[in-house]
Interface confidence: medium
Amino acid sequence: GITIPRNPGCPNSEDKNFPRTVMVNLNIHNRNTNTNPKRSSDYYNRSTSPWNLHRNEDPERYPSVIWEAKCRHLGCINADGNVDYHMNSVPIQQEILVLRREPPHCPNSFRLEKILVSVGCTCVTPIVHHVA
Amino acid sequence: GITIPRNPGCPNSEDKNFPRTVMVNLNIHNRNTNTNPKRSSDYYNRSTSPWNLHRNEDPERYPSVIWEAKCRHLGCINADGNVDYHMNSVPIQQEILVLRREPPHCPNSFRLEKILVSVGCTCVTPIVHHVA
């Protein structure tokens, strides 16, 4: 395996809660600059399982605004543009890490929090339960 | 906007980089407990735009291993179970926050980083460009 020596320049934490509480630099580095900037911006309308985006705001959270997908239909859009109820539109959910101010209203103290968000929808074949 | 008074019990940061560097409690709180725990675990196989999960590892990042969705087909699966190339399978992408050790190999000092991940795939009607 890779043996990585501890960096001698590491901050020395004397915090009694260490290692539960750590220093985090919020000067966010964005690794996405080299990715294809053509995002899934219009997929929500063009998908066979289209969705709407709903704004969720919380001033005590970073990021404070999160956009949530809600599938428009129970079924999926077929080739004729009608809803086919033999298929299901389902949300693709993803957990994201956010920072919550703790104690509340403190500008420099946070707790990591996991929240579940719906990112978009996909069309799936339903699970059919046969009753004996 | 709402003016929220500063909590008098906030930790006092004397860090010269304040407010860029903050204290974060890593005891991750999970806000998902009241949501429907029926995950999108099997959608990757049941979708009309199915996907595979590919492993991306970086030991200096949390989470160190990220499984990325890659659409299996250019087209979408039709009612007969065949790939229909008149439709397109496309990845749904989302930015997530990750923590990067900074300086490297330090267990108690981090920088927030945004990365773009593909969460799953959806089936969309293609954009057709008509040549004059």
């Epitope: 959910q93 957990e95 | 725990p37 989470p63 160190s64 291993v65 050790r101």
Partner: antibody, heavy 126, light 107 residues
Framework: EVQLVQSGAEVKKPGESVKISCKAS????????ISWVRQAPGQGLEWMGG????????DYAQKFQGRVTITADESTTTAYMELSGLTSDDTAVYYC???????????????????WGQGTTVTVSS | EIVLTQSPDFQSVTPKEKVTITCRAS??????LHWYQQKPDQSPKLLIK???HSISGVPSRFSGSGSGTDFTLTINGLEAEDAGTYYC?????????FGRGTKVDIK
């Protein structure tokens, strides 16, 4: 290939402590956690606690709280489990198991144990 | 803590037969259930993760299903080398807990 190699068998007297090591190779040490699971003779598996190597965070089962200490040394890619105040009930095979820290299918996953050490037999007898 | 109830405790099976082992959780754990095989005097080995996801190197005769509180491990066409004890494990909530195990032996 990922391997977890544990230290050898131990014979201890009641009241003593035991410290077992688990040397990891074939993977990047910060990328996973190490959990410790024990198995008494003829019994099932019992989780004792674990450490997330990336942060150094430790979690212990309440039953062992105060008696068990789990540590990890990133420079040698070795995890340790020390159990104090031994009694004959602690006679068991002790396993270390690797716990990936991963974002899996849309989730910051809580984990399976994908690789296990060979086990260390600890016998407590007066 | 979450209690996992495995059944049966013991199963004696003829080669090529189908084996079904169930695991019931005392509360909803979503898909956070994993299955392990332990052969005598060996360490446990991961067979299935997240209820139904196969592990590379594990024969395709092993499959898992279920979500919430009810889970199943199926061995389609048991082979002699499959003798051992099978454990379910939940990672939805700390502490991690295991089922008591199902011992499978070959007739």
């Amino acid at each position: 290939e990922v391997q977890l190699v544990q230290s050898g068998a131990e014979v201890k007297k009641p009241g003593e402590s035991v410290k077992i090591s688990c040397k990891a190779s074939g993977g990047s040490f910060p990328s996973y956690g190490i959990s410790w699971v024990r198995q008494a003779p003829g019994q099932g598996l019992e989780w004792m606690g674990g450490i997330t190597n990336f942060f150094g965070i430790r979690d212990y089962a309440q039953k062992f709280q105060g008696r068990v200490t789990i540590t990890a040394d990133e420079s040698t890619t070795t995890a340790y489990m020390e159990l104090s105040g031994l009694t004959s009930d602690d006679t068991a095979v002790y396993y270390c198991a690797r716990e990936p820290n991963e974002f899996w299918n849309g989730y910051y996953a809580t984990h399976d144990f994908d690789y296990w050490g060979q086990g260390t037999t600890v016998t407590v007898s007066s | 803590e979450i209690v996992l109830t495995q059944s049966p405790d013991f199963q004696s099976v003829t080669p090529k037969e189908k084996v079904t082992i169930t695991c019931r959780a005392s509360q909803d754990i979503g898909y956070e259930l994993h299955w392990y095989q332990q052969k005598p005097d060996q360490s446990p080995k991961l067979l299935i993760k997240y209820a139904s996801h196969s592990i590379s190197g594990v024969p395709s005769r092993f499959s898992g299903s279920g979500s919430g509180t009810d889970f199943t491990l199926t061995i389609n066409g048991l082979e002699a080398e499959d003798a051992g004890t099978y454990y379910c494990h939940q990672s939805s909530e700390l502490p991690h807990t295991f089922g008591r195990g199902t011992k499978v032996d070959i007739k």
